[in-house]
Interface confidence: low
């Protein structure tokens, strides 16, 4: 039982502290009172707190807790946000380089294809960017579209330059023939495999980083329960009611209170650990065909090889396509 | 063989990026991120302790507050009495996580499963198929240059890693880094409403 306050005890000290929290002094008693209406700072004797003060302390305690939580996660949040932005931009740069490499290959090796090839290559790499960012695009379709678009141009410009420019009718037939005759050999399949694997991994890597940000944001902005507010108030502010302005909470007591307040948040721990370890596993596997940088920056060479493959088989192909698309060609020459 | 595409860099900064030898690579940057993230692997389980160490707690004082009275820092009462007659701490824990936390746990489960699927053989079925089709004939040298494309005269060496950071300049200015702003962080002043 604490000694009763002296007969001349006042609540001046408490009042001057409380004034910083809540300008307007009418809530603080002049002298210690029984405090029978208090619900959190239950008095063992006369107290300098009122019910209204208690409510204010609870509000402040919860705010403090929210600030402390945000401060705790600031470094982690910054790390993930910064890296998510860095990698997103880096992947965009890789895509831009890959496009430039491929365009350069066309310009230097197949200048007659360039205007159209640039357009198709541009569309392909735009789709690559969208896919990395999470768009519902199918990688196989992207690759097929690239080769479907390239082949009519290769056929009319390199293999059969005598055809008129308005080869619209034959284009459709050539697009179909491209797949049926496996005009580019296995190269489209190779590119599909490499591109889809490397982009899938890249996309999920970015997705995981963005979810990491969402996790931190969620726990960063948690609203603490009334029960927690009461516990925090008892720990941080109830001492003031007894005029004990300079004392601090006991360490063990603080840990018990925090574990109570954060019981829900701590449940994330298991999945957070697994998240970091799974992300590490993914990153360790991001090499060779699982490394989009490696795959995309080498695409120009594979596409070049695929065109060489077409040129090697040009004679046989021209004959077959001549028969296959004869109907379209006759209509054109008329 | 394919003409090395060096003269069609639409923006000239790319040349600088492609040929810087000592900048970080994307893969080293990824590994660095993982190492930093791993230092936060216990972030959530360590939160209660972290918050106590960053809020006013009696460290050197002989006496401390246990929620009801002033006690000696090492006495039994220091941790126990404050919880009496208030509400059951166990009950508080039993309420389980808030819906918003449950939702984020579900999302983490989803992404963890996805990450595992991509890392496990189940997500990597095509490795051997590639070799069977004869598209990959092993790595080309054991440095970080990698051979790309077919064999024969079509093969050229491309620098495997893009030295992208020369262009990115990702390091923030010191002024932008957290804790260096003029705004007082809770760590600096122990929250403006604590007056010790």
């Amino acid at each position: 039982q604490p000694p009763p306050p002296p007969p001349d005890a006042t609540c001046h000290q408490v009042r001057s502290f409380f004034q910083r929290l809540q300008p307007g002094l009418k809530w603080v008693p002049e002298t210690p009172v029984p405090g029978s209406d208090l619900q959190v700072c239950l008095p063992k004797g006369p107290t300098c707190c009122s019910r209204k003060m208690e409510e204010k302390y609870q509000l402040t305690a919860r705010l403090n807790m929210e600030q402390l939580l945000q401060s705790a996660s600031m470094e982690l949040k910054f790390l993930i946000i910064q890296n998510a932005a860095v990698f997103q931009e880096a992947f965009e740069i890789v895509v831009r380089h890959a496009k430039n490499y491929t365009n350069a290959m066309f310009k230097n090796n197949y200048p007659s294809l360039t205007p159209q090839a640039f357009e198709f290559v541009g569309e392909f790499f735009t789709d690559v960017s969208l896919y990395i960012l999470g768009s519902d695009i199918n990688v196989d379709d992207m690759v097929n579209e690239l080769f479907d678009s390239l082949f009519p141009v290769i056929y009319t410009q390199l293999m059969n330059p005598g055809l008129p420019d308005s080869a619209l009718d034959i284009n459709e037939c050539l697009r179909g023939a491209r797949r049926d005759l496996k005009v580019f050999g296995n190269f489209p399949k190779l590119i599909m495999t490499q591109v889809s694997k490397s982009l899938q991994v890249t996309r999920i890597f970015l997705q995981a980083l963005n979810l990491g940000i969402e996790v931190i944001n969620t726990t960063d902005h948690l609203k603490f329960s009334k029960d927690c507010g009461r516990m925090l108030t008892r720990m941080w502010y109830c001492s003031y009611c007894q005029g004990l302005m300079m004392v601090k909470p006991c360490g063990g007591y603080c840990n018990v209170v925090m574990q109570g307040c954060m019981a829900g948040v701590v449940e994330i721990d298991k999945y957070w650990r697994e998240y970091i370890l799974s992300l590490e596993e993914l990153v360790n596997g991001m090499y060779r065909i699982y490394d989009m940088e490696n795959v995309l920056l080498g695409l120009f060479s594979t596409i070049h090889d695929s065109i060489q493959y077409v040129q090697k088989n040009a004679g046989k192909l021209t004959t077959t396509i001549g028969k296959l698309c004869a109907h379209s060609q006759q209509r054109q020459y008329r | 063989s394919a003409y090395y595409p060096e003269d069609l860099f639409i923006d000239k900064k790319v040349l600088k990026v492609a040929h810087v030898e000592h900048e970080e690579t994307l893969s080293s940057r990824r590994r660095e991120l993982i190492q930093k993230l791993k230092s936060f692997i216990s972030f959530y389980s360590a939160l209660p302790g972290y918050i106590c160490s960053h809020s006013p707690v009696a460290e050197n004082d002989t006496l401390c507050w246990n929620g009801q009275e002033l006690v000696e820092r090492y006495s039994q009462k220091a941790a126990r009495n404050g919880m009496k007659n208030q509400f059951n701490l166990h009950e508080l824990k039993m309420k389980g996580p808030e819906p918003v936390v449950s939702q984020i746990i579900d999302k983490l489960k989803h992404i963890n499963q996805l990450l595992r699927t991509m890392s496990m053989p189940k997500g990597r079925v095509l490795d051997k198929n590639l070799d069977e089709e004869g598209f990959e004939s092993g790595d080309c040298g054991d440095d970080e240059d990698e051979c790309i494309g077919g064999s024969g005269d079509g093969m050229i060496k491309v620098k495997n890693q893009l030295r992208f950071l020369a262009e990115l300049a990702y390091d923030l200015d010191v002024d932008d880094a957290p804790g260096n702003s003029q705004q007082a962080t809770p760590k600096d002043n122990e929250i403006s409403t604590f007056h010790n």
Epitope: L130, I204 | K107, K109, Q113
Partner: antibody, heavy 120, light 108 residues
């Protein structure tokens, strides 16, 4: 907790179009993939197409290609599905469903469904 | 294109275990999700990634997936479990979701 609230039941004539809305609340709308799934009376679930609001590009099932248009308005966190050239076999309950990110995540939240009746 | 085959109906006595199968070529290599749909209501996710349970779904619901069959198991079946159950995978070639035909679970 994400909540998806759909527009009310519709009765339409064959040959006309219907536009069903799906308003999302409680989540980051732009990063969710919103799909539309329909269920004819006494039948199973059939995926029609989907959209990720942050990209705006939609992806459709082959069967509905050319007849369905899926859009999203980030400002109002609302996704729309418009089905044209309606026929009696389009009579069904149309659901919107959301999922986190990309394949192969499940549809974790569903709207209450919108009954569209096509009848002359 | 993936095709998923489910039995049209399964009957089980209260308190017993119900098993609903979902057949598909090499389905074990895919992630399977299960949905419960009660009459007049929207589907509800009950199992995802073969065997994970969303919060709020009783532990009585479990899943497994290997070879050519995925299975949803409901132990200690209750009257409230009576519903249609659908399996779903993502078809990797089209990147589109595919649903099974559905199984009506009747609690006797």
């Amino acid at each position: 907790e994400v909540q998806l609230v759909q527009s009310g039941a519709e009765v339409k004539k064959p040959g006309s179009s219907v536009k069903v809305s799906c308003k999302a609340s409680g989540g980051t709308f732009r990063s969710y993939a919103i799909s539309w799934v329909r269920q004819a009376p006494g039948q199973g679930l059939e995926w029609m197409g989907g959209i990720i609001p942050i990209f705006g590009t939609a992806n459709y099932a082959q069967k509905f290609q050319g007849r369905v248009t899926i859009t999203a308005d980030e400002l109002t966190s609302t996704a729309y599905m418009e089905l044209s050239s309606l026929r009696s076999e389009d009579t069904a309950v149309y659901y919107c469903a959301s999922r986190i990110g990309q394949w192969p995540t499940p549809f974790d939240y569903w709207g209450q469904g919108t009954l569209v009746t096509v009848s002359s | 294109q993936s095709v998923l085959t489910q039995p049209p109906s399964v009957s089980v006595a209260p308190g017993k275990t119900a098993r609903i199968t979902c057949g598909g070529n090499n389905i074990g290599s895919k992630s399977v999700h299960w949905y419960q749909q009660k009459p007049g209501q929207a589907p509800v996710l009950v199992i995802y990634y073969d065997s994970d349970r969303p919060s709020g779904i009783p532990e009585r619901f479990s899943g497994s997936n290997s070879g050519n069959t995925a299975t949803l198991t409901i132990s200690r079946v209750e009257a409230g479990d009576e519903a249609d159950y659908y399996c779903q995978v993502w078809d990797s070639s089209s990147d589109h979701p595919v649903f099974g035909g559905g199984t009506k679970l009747t609690v006797l």
